[in-house]
Amino acid sequence: ARNGDHCPLGPGRCCRLHTVRASLEDLGWADWVLSPREVQVTMCIGACPSQFRAANMHAQIKTSLHRLKPDTVPAPCCVPASYNPMVLIQKTDTGVSLQTYDDLLAKDCHCI
Amino acid sequence: ARNGDHCPLGPGRCCRLHTVRASLEDLGWADWVLSPREVQVTMCIGACPSQFRAANMHAQIKTSLHRLKPDTVPAPCCVPASYNPMVLIQKTDTGVSLQTYDDLLAKDCHCI
């Protein structure tokens, strides 16, 4: 079950899925990827205030300890809970190949 | 395969497992946990410099985009890669029970 989906910092500022455009050059992929020329990277961005989308008990503990020891324990962090596959057309020695990567695009986010 | 386990920031400064001592009061558990009175919480703390313990391709992309768009894309974050179980003795209506929690203590860390 998802803990607190209401963002106390204002709409869009807490941990959520966000799309960032990147060129092959940005990613250092220009020498091995043919297509797409630009990638829509879905990633998890935003703050993780107390109990917002807490992934598990560890995240809840982290929130409590961050409040008590902010210099030692960082706040929970917004990271992917699951991924969507992504298809790239790659250069190969013999020509090109269609390759699917399962850990490239975030699908859903939580705080941990 | 683990990307770069050498920390460029100096020994112990990069993402790794730490143990933080916490009382039941610290965690807000005093009213439902009997034992232990103190918990040694293992958690993932430390910086995630370029490609250090990158969990997957998403983490590698995040590093590249953080370099290009630091205001939008945060650096990868140090989070648990796996957990160790922890047993708590809990208060119940009828007495006490032994409960195992699988997502409470970090066992291993990576950057994502």
């Epitope: 204002g10 709409p11 869009g12 500022r13 959520r16 899925l17 966000h18 799309t19 960032v20 455009r21 060129s23 297509s35 797409p36 020329r37 630009e38 829509q40 879905t42 961005i45 969507n84 596959p85 992504m86 298809v87 790239l88 057309i89 269609l98 699917t100 695009l105 | 768009k69 205001d71 939008t72």
Partner: antibody, heavy 113, light 110 residues
Framework: SVKESGGRLVTPGTPLTLTCKAS????????MSWVRQAPGKGLEWIGT??????GTWYASWVKGRFTISKTSTTVDLKMTSLTTEDTATYFC??????????WGPGTLVTVSS | DIVLTQTAASVSEPVGGTVTIKCQAS??????LAWYQQKPGQPPKLLIY???DLASGVPSRFKGSGYGTEFTLTISGVQCGDAATYYC????????????FGGGTEVVVK
């Protein structure tokens, strides 16, 4: 380039499928969107598909009436329960967020009794 | 879905003047905003992506700025050929956002 087809005059309630055909790039690696524009009105986003995974996103007003799907060479927009309010030019777009967003010329759908 | 508000439905400016069009997002979208120009009978043409990056072939008279929730398109040295309707679009894809367009601002060049 991209080109839409399938737009025509239909009566209310008739289902209709629009097709977007791409040339010059591989659909399987791009995000594709459908956008519509009623006569004399503004642009309205319908939804987006990532052809690589088939993952879809829709505007909240769509409410299951429209479905975006893909084949190896096309991106289709299946429309059901059409009303006169759905009369518009429907655009297929390679996007949303490419520095070289490509729009088709559009296909006109007229819903009238 | 996110709401994009273009405050002015229409603006009028003499040739050579400067036009400013504002777009406000109902939630924080970082730099995920594009600007389009549309002339009657034509599909929209991309001018600006990522809030401030100029699309290929677009004159440098067009400038995008802003971040978060407030965005602006500025056309300096406006020309007769700039008469068109301009739309902002959220280019973020997430369950809460979506690729909503603003209502459009018509630019009339006198």
């Amino acid at each position: 380039s991209v080109k839409e087809s399938g737009g025509r005059l239909v009566t209310p309630g008739t289902p209709l499928t629009l097709t977007c055909k791409a040339s010059g790039f591989s659909l399987s690696t791009y995000w594709m969107s459908w956008v519509r524009q009623a006569p004399g009105k503004g642009l309205e986003w319908i939804g987006t598909i990532y052809a690589g995974s088939g993952g879809t996103w829709y505007a909240s007003w769509v409410k299951g009436r429209f479905t975006i799907s893909k084949t190896s060479t096309t991106v289709d927009l299946k429309m059901t329960s059409l009303t006169t309010e759905d009369t518009a030019t429907y655009f297929c777009v390679r996007g949303p967020n490419y520095s070289d967003a490509i729009w088709g010329p559009g296909t006109l759908v007229t819903v009238s009794s | 879905d996110i709401v994009l508000t273009q405050t002015a439905a229409s603006v009028s400016e003499p040739v050579g003047g400067t036009v400013t069009i504002k777009c406000q997002a109902s939630e924080y979208i970082y730099s995920s905003l594009a600007w389009y120009q549309q002339k009657p009978g034509q599909p929209p043409k991309l001018l600006i992506y990522d809030a401030s990056d100029l699309a290929s072939g677009v004159p440098s008279r067009f400038k995008g700025s802003g971040y978060g929730t407030e965005f602006t398109l500025t056309i300096s040295g406006v020309q007769c050929g700039d008469a068109a309707t301009y739309y902002c679009q959220c280019t973020d894809l997430s369950s809460s956002a979506g690729n909503t367009f603003g209502g459009g601002t018509e630019v009339v060049v006198k």
